[in-house]
């Protein structure tokens, strides 16, 4: 399930104060978020219309097909996020791959991802002043899913 | 799109050496990965059988329903990961919500997430010794998607 991609160990010095929110600047270069869409777009095929393909990546073959929209901010960690954008309001027929079935809705699956922004610290200015990381929840759509509509009570 | 969930700022002291791989121990308490599944399980209902509900969370209403399996490792950052486990080999009929349609496959959407493992540093032991973070790619299934089967060439 896992793959080692770096040297075995990175030493952790005990140099920083014990406040839980503190990070060394170097942490920002180690981005634990995706740098490309979850399902790599290995194929030249790309869905930009409401149809389910019989080949290509998973987001093209889904009956709730989606494309990935880039959301980049060089002053955020992670810099690159990808949002799944549903290409159909309803699910596509399994038979034809093109006609929509109004009995199913194609809806985004959302996830609140933690991101960090750099902000000047209160009362500190200039290049040599300390700075802050502002932690925020940022809503990202991971994929589109074909669901049965909610039953109204 | 974003929501502030912490105090405005977390001071970043410039105290740590410049080696890119170094982290303070406190970083481990700041887990930038979800501590709950992407689609919050607000309901007591959760699918453990192959059927698509008309209510409940998205993973229950999907015609490719899935459950979330917790993957916890106290020596990993993030400690908690959730894997989507598909409950059906094929997609469920939109009409009935229970009968499977062999024309569609229910497949997991995978993503290689960067994680860090805590390891004792070479030649150091005990609670006060330094430790290392080993960086790995870890495959996580985010959701299950109903797709048209691949067309065989």
């Amino acid at each position: 399930v896992s793959l080692r991609i770096q040297e075995d160990c990175s030493h952790l010095p005990r140099c920083c104060p014990s406040k839980q929110q503190e990070f060394p600047e170097e942490w920002l270069k180690w981005n634990p978020a995706p740098v490309s869409p979850p399902e790599p777009l290995r194929h030249t095929h790309h869905p930009e219309s409401c149809r389910a393909s019989k080949d290509g990546p998973l987001n093209s073959r889904a009956i709730s097909p989606w494309s990935y929209e880039l959301d980049r901010d060089l002053n955020r960690v992670p810099q690159d996020l990808y949002h799944a954008r549903c290409l159909c309001p309803h699910c596509v027929s399994l038979q034809t791959g093109s006609h929509m079935d109004p009995m199913g809705n194609s809806v985004p699956l959302y996830h609140n991802q933690t991101v960090f922004y750099r902000r000047p610290c209160h009362g500190e200015q200039g290049a040599h002043g300390r700075y802050c990381l502002e932690r925020r929840l940022y809503r990202v759509s991971l994929a589109c899913v074909c669901v049965r509509p909610r039953m109204m009570a | 799109v974003s929501l502030r969930i912490q105090e405005d700022c977390s001071h970043l002291p410039r105290c740590c050496p410049s080696k890119q791989q170094e982290f303070p121990e406190e970083w481990l308490k700041w887990n930038p990965a979800p501590v709950s599944p992407p689609e919050p399980l607000r309901h007591t209902h959760h699918p453990e059988s192959c059927r698509a509900s008309k209510d409940g969370p998205l993973n229950s209403r999907a015609i490719s329903p899935w459950s979330y399996e917790l993957d916890r490792d106290l020596n990993r950052v993030p400690q908690d990961l959730y894997h989507a486990r598909c409950l059906c080999p094929h997609c469920v009929s939109l009409q009935t919500g229970s009968h499977m349609d062999p024309m569609g496959n229910s497949v997991p959407l995978y993503h290689n997430q960067t994680v860090f493992y805590r390891r004792p540093c070479h030649g150091e032991q005990g609670a006060h010794g330094r430790y290392c973070l080993e960086r790995r790619l870890y495959r996580v299934s985010l959701a299950c998607v109903c797709v048209r089967p691949r067309m065989m060439a």
């Epitope: 740098v35 869409p37 929209e69 880039l70 959301d71 980049r72 901010d73 060089l74 002053n75 | -």
Partner: antibody, heavy 120, light 107 residues
């Protein structure tokens, strides 16, 4: 008019380091990023990475990520690119370019280039 | 990494000709494609960004089109100063990558 002025040509030996500077003027430095691109003699363009001038957050190309460091100095509106452990195939013209910090990542103004020659 | 393939690798055309250069990405890049012009010994100059937007100060004879994997740069009426190398660049996924360039010569 926006200007990016780079430091002069450098000749280095294999294993040495080089630090190229890029002085920006006539725009609000912190509102943009700086990207670094190189071009080996007779070859195409190769993206090395970029830095958000306000945050200092970086992204490096995997090929050079263990040897490169990009920094900015807001007080002098200057960006720096340091490449360590130089090899002969690092011989190239190194360009800095201004880049927006958002999704549309185009390089609208470029420095004049700095020739770095690595030779024993 | 995403491969960017340009064609033709070189062309020779007369003043007033309509010139078309194509760029193909190895995978979908939506509209995250830019075009640059580079003259010998000089830095590249931005012509078109996000596939079809004309950079300020660039003559209207330059236009760009396409999305997904196939893109086109068109010079509607070639001028003597348009010689040089034209390069496409994708910015959808890091590392950003460039095409190998198309050399345009004036007949």
């Amino acid at each position: 008019q926006v200007q990016l002025v780079q430091s002069g040509a450098e000749v280095k030996k294999p294993g040495a380091s080089v630090k190229v500077s890029c002085k920006a003027s006539e725009y609000t430095f912190s509102n943009y990023g700086i990207s670094w691109v190189r071009q080996a003699p007779g070859q195409g363009l190769e993206w090395l990475g970029w830095i958000g001038a306000y945050s200092g957050f970086t992204k490096y190309a995997q090929k050079v990520q263990d040897r490169i460091t990009m920094t900015t100095d807001a007080s002098t509106t200057t960006a720096y690119m340091e490449l360590r452990n130089l090899r002969s195939d690092d011989t190239a013209v190194y360009y800095c370019a201004r880049v927006g910090t958002g999704t549309d990542s185009y390089f609208d103004f470029w420095g004049q280039g700095t020739l770095v020659t690595v030779s024993s | 990494d995403i491969q960017m393939t340009q064609s033709p690798s070189s062309l020779s055309a007369s003043v007033g000709d309509r010139v078309t250069i194509t760029c193909r990405a190895s995978q979908n890049i939506n509209s995250h494609l830019n075009w640059y012009q580079q003259k010998p010994g000089k830095a590249p100059k931005l012509l078109i960004y996000t596939a079809s937007s004309l950079q300020s100060g660039v003559p209207l004879r330059f236009s760009g089109s396409g999305s997904g994997t196939d893109f086109t740069l068109t010079i509607s009426s070639l001028q003597p100063e348009d010689f040089g190398i034209y390069i496409c660049q994708q910015t959808y996924i890091t590392p950003l990558t460039f095409g190998g360039g198309t050399k345009v010569e004036i007949k």
